[in-house]
């Protein structure tokens, strides 16, 4: 069965099956390089 990609909070459909958070937070550290 089809899974709908995680959509942001104002979208009508949302599921975590995409493996991505609905509204990912900004990383708080910066990788070297």
């Amino acid at each position: 069965s089809e899974t709908t990609t995680g959509t942001s909070s104002n979208s009508s459909q949302s599921t975590s099956n995409s493996g991505l958070a609905p509204n990912p937070t900004n990383a708080t550290t910066k990788a070297a390089g």
């Epitope: 089809e2 899974t3 990609t5 995680g6 959509t7 975590s16 995409s18 991505l20 958070a21 990912p24």
Partner: antibody, heavy 115, light 112 residues
Framework: EVRLEESGGGFVQPGGSMKLSCVAS????????MNWVRQSPERGLAWVAQ??????????RYVESVKGRFTISRDDSESTVYLQMNNLRAEDTGIYYC??????WGQGTTLTVSS | DVVMTQTPLTLSLTIGQPASISCKSS???????????LNWLLQRPGQSPKRLIY???NMDSGVPDRFTGSGSGTDFTLKISRVEAEDLGIYYC?????????FGGGTKLEIK
Amino acid sequence: EVRLEESGGGFVQPGGSMKLSCVASGLTFPNHWMNWVRQSPERGLAWVAQIQLKSDNYATRYVESVKGRFTISRDDSESTVYLQMNNLRAEDTGIYYCTTGTDYWGQGTTLTVSS
Amino acid sequence: DVVMTQTPLTLSLTIGQPASISCKSSQSLLYSDGKTYLNWLLQRPGQSPKRLIYLVSNMDSGVPDRFTGSGSGTDFTLKISRVEAEDLGIYYCVQGTHFPYTFGGGTKLEIK
């Protein structure tokens, strides 16, 4: 069966431009965020860009290294996502995969940036 | 960016042996909805990546039950109870909690 098919890769000189396309089938395309991921021997897998839904006003996100150079767009009527790449650099070389998230991946299209 | 560190770099095993791959993130991957967006992918030689596991431990359809994912916060593990020939390739962890999404460097599973 979900299929994502990329095209548009090739050879380009530094500073040049290229436009990649990805046609999706087997899914309700307008309901899916779409992403481009790059793979290179030097840098491994790296997420490049994302475009969200019409209901999100087609919001886009980019990794810092491509901001101002790459533009992701989509045509829901054609179930297609695009990646317009300008001012290309050698480090942009790699296989570009179209993905819905982490779940579905295309076969990839190769871009080589070299003089 | 969130750094994803995978160990070991290479696993060289015989058919039937167990395998364990570690993935550590530089920040917690627990999202505000209570879910942890940690995924495992397998890239077989000459192929594109294929997802095995999402949300730490949820297996995708068609994935053999010899694969299990576990962990929380910053420390995650992929285990294969008994390695089979079709398992060879490079395993990647990837986080979808923080922007930009980031991948581990990969663990190559070789069959002796």
